[in-house]
Interface confidence: low
């Protein structure tokens, strides 16, 4: 018996061939011997089966001795043994129809679980192998689960159902809803304007939800909400903003926040959360702000940084075009009795300068100038 696998919703063509290459009488029946379709001369006739409105054949092939049964919009319950009667012979074809669906929605938040469920006819024992967009394979039975979805899991999942050494392939498009970056860090000199950007890693027709930025300043004992906002059809509107600092927010995507001035009391880390309409859970992006200040007080030149710096970052004070006078893995460095000239304070990581602040030291009778 020939086995043919079909996909729910698709069209399948079951073949039946006579030895005579001409149009002769044929009938297709199901396992209950109920007639599905056949011919009467050059006319197609249909029987009383449940497939009535979805069954068809190709009259153009009859003259070649081919009498296919075409079933449109396949359903799981169409799985059956179909019998073609032609020339006093019976050809049996077993049709097995499978369906593969994603749990509830194909748009899932980063960190959520994806469950793929296989619908299969009774008595079948298929195995399923799915390949994710990043090329990883999952194998399983009637359900396949992937926990902790990551950004790289966005895209087309290709799933192969194997039954009786035959295969049928499903493609499911999964969109992982996430920010492009899980975390970002901004380095600024004191007084500079700070731009925070939160680009999304997906595009959808309509995007509605609400968000909030919580900020934990390094100097503060607790975190506080800096801004709350609404998102309606990709338009951003601010609901509430603190007076200090007074953040400004862009009206369009990507989400964009401006802090008028980088000050030591603002240095720290924030967590922007975005709750999307009709989704459980939230999107998160961490943002960090490091602020640098260089000052000269009497005979002491000091450079300080505030905010979440890694222990391997180096803070240096050097006179322009000279070797560093002081260089430490600390958050403050200083030079006593600095000689006159343009001094540079550098925050660097493995030789790469992340932040630089210049301060001009004048001869001792003058006051310092910050360019």
């Amino acid at each position: 018996k020939k086995v043919v696998l079909g996909k729910k919703g698709d069209t399948v063509e079951l073949t039946c061939t006579a030895s005579q290459k001409k149009s002769i009488q044929f009938h297709w029946k199901n396992s209950n011997q109920i007639k599905i379709l056949g011919n009467q001369g050059s006319f197609l006739t249909k029987g009383p089966s449940k497939l009535n409105d979805r069954a068809d054949s190709r009259r153009s092939l009859w003259d070649q001795g081919n009498f296919p049964l075409i079933i449109k919009n396949l359903k799981i319950e169409d799985s059956d043994t179909y019998i073609c009667e032609v020339e006093d012979q019976k050809e049996e074809v077993q049709l097995l129809v499978f369906g593969l669906t994603a749990n509830s929605d194909t748009h899932l938040l980063q960190g959520q679980s994806l469950t793929l469920t296989l619908e299969s006819p009774p008595g079948s024992s298929p195995s399923v192998q799915c390949r994710s967009p990043r090329g990883k394979n999952i194998q399983g039975g009637k359900t396949l689960s992937v926990s902790q979805l990551e950004l790289q899991d966005s895209g087309t999942w290709t799933c192969t159902v194997l039954q009786n050494q035959k295969k049928v392939e499903f493609k499911i498009d999964i969109v992982v809803l996430a920010f492009q970056k899980a975390s970002s860090i901004v380095y600024k000199k004191e007084g500079e304007q700070v731009e925070f950007s939160f680009p999304l890693a997906f595009t959808v027709e309509k995007l509605t939800g609400s968000g909030e930025l919580w900020w934990q300043a390094e100097r503060a004992s607790s975190s506080k909400s800096w801004i709350t906002f609404d998102l309606k059809n990709k338009e951003v509107s601010v609901k509430r903003v603190t007076q200090d600092p007074k953040l400004q927010m862009g009206k369009k995507l990507p989400l964009h926040l401006t802090l008028p001035q980088a000050l030591p009391q603002y240095a720290g880390s924030g967590n922007l959360t975005l709750a999307l309409e009709a989704k459980t859970g939230k999107l998160h992006q961490e943002v960090n702000l490091v602020v640098m200040r260089a000052t000269q007080l009497q005979k002491n030149l000091t450079c300080e940084v505030w905010g979440p710096t890694s222990p391997k970052l180096m803070l240096s004070l050097k006179l322009e075009n000279k070797e560093a006078k002081v260089s430490k893995r600390e958050k403050a460095v200083w030079v006593l009795n600095p000689e006159a000239g343009m001094w540079q304070c550098l925050l660097s990581d493995s030789g790469q300068v992340l932040l630089e602040s210049n301060i001009k030291v004048l001869p001792t009778w003058s006051t310092p100038v910050q360019p």
Epitope: S125, P126, S127, I138, G140, K142, S145, V146, L162
Partner: antibody, heavy 120, light 107 residues
Framework: QVQLQESDPGLVKPSETLSLTCTVS????????WSWIRQPAGKGLEWIGR???????NYNPSLKSRVTMSVDTSKNQFSLKLSSVTAADTAVYYC??????????????WGQGTTVTVSS | DIQMTQSPSSLSASVGDRVTITCQAS??????LNWYQQKPGKAPNLLIY???NLETGVPSRFSGSGSGTDFTFTISSLQPEDIAAYYC?????????FGQGTRLEIK
């Protein structure tokens, strides 16, 4: 609570075929892969292969030529046959359930193991 | 086949100590690594799946980390009942392979 129990083959003579059966109780054999793993005394774990409820198999290439696995869903059992055994096949043989899904993957239920000695 | 190299092969530590075992894969296996505990005369027991996820019912003193080729298994405060052999296992590709194991004993 799913439990696995390996059969006891006792002593097997060199060049003969080792046959083991694992009985699954407290749950269905369907919708999972089922693995065989062995461990020579004082040594590490070696994966022999696995079988799915539908009968599809994956074998370790190092043993493929000698291994046959089968499944009997009506009895909730799966079996291992290892042909042309030598003293090097002496080990504790375990059956285990492979939890599906690649993030969730893990051999999360194991039999208690059965000692197989190959000796004339 | 992907080779898994565990180190050390054996170690001795005192109750309350922090114990670390490493596992190195011969090629990139992303996060597709599990850790098992095997007590003498018993079958292995799954502790950590997908490099860092604690299996249900496993004490929180056990943890795992790593990605790519280098992985670490840690017991934050060694208890007498932790005396066992520990194995890493990759499932990035077939055949599934295990590390050679680390035997842990109490000083």
């Amino acid at each position: 609570q799913v439990q696995l129990q390996e059969s006891d083959p006792g002593l097997v003579k060199p060049s003969e075929t080792l046959s083991l059966t694992c009985t699954v109780s407290g749950g269905s054999i369907s919708s999972y892969y089922w693995s065989w793993i062995r461990q020579p005394a004082g040594k590490g774990l070696e994966w022999i292969g696995r079988i799915y409820a539908s009968g599809s198999t994956n074998y370790n290439p190092s043993l493929k030529s000698r291994v046959t696995m089968s499944v009997d869903t009506s009895k909730n059992q799966f079996s291992l046959k290892l042909s042309s055994v030598t003293a090097a096949d002496t080990a504790v043989y375990y059956c285990a359930r492979d939890r599906e899904g690649y993030y969730y993957y893990g051999m999360d239920v194991w039999g208690q193991g059965t000692t197989v000695t190959v000796s004339s | 086949d992907i080779q898994m190299t565990q180190s050390p092969s054996s170690l001795s530590a005192s109750v309350g100590d922090r114990v670390t075992i490493t596992c190195q894969a011969s090629q990139d296996i992303s996060k597709y690594l599990n850790w098992y505990q095997q007590k003498p005369g018993k079958a292995p027991n799954l502790l950590i799946y997908a490099a860092s996820n604690l299996e249900t019912g496993v004490p929180s003193r056990f943890s795992g980390s790593g990605s790519g080729t280098d992985f670490t298994f840690t017991i934050s405060s060694l208890q007498p009942e932790d005396i066992a052999a520990y194995y890493c296992q990759q499932y990035d590709s077939l055949p599934i392979t295990f590390g050679q194991g680390t035997r842990l004993e109490i000083k």
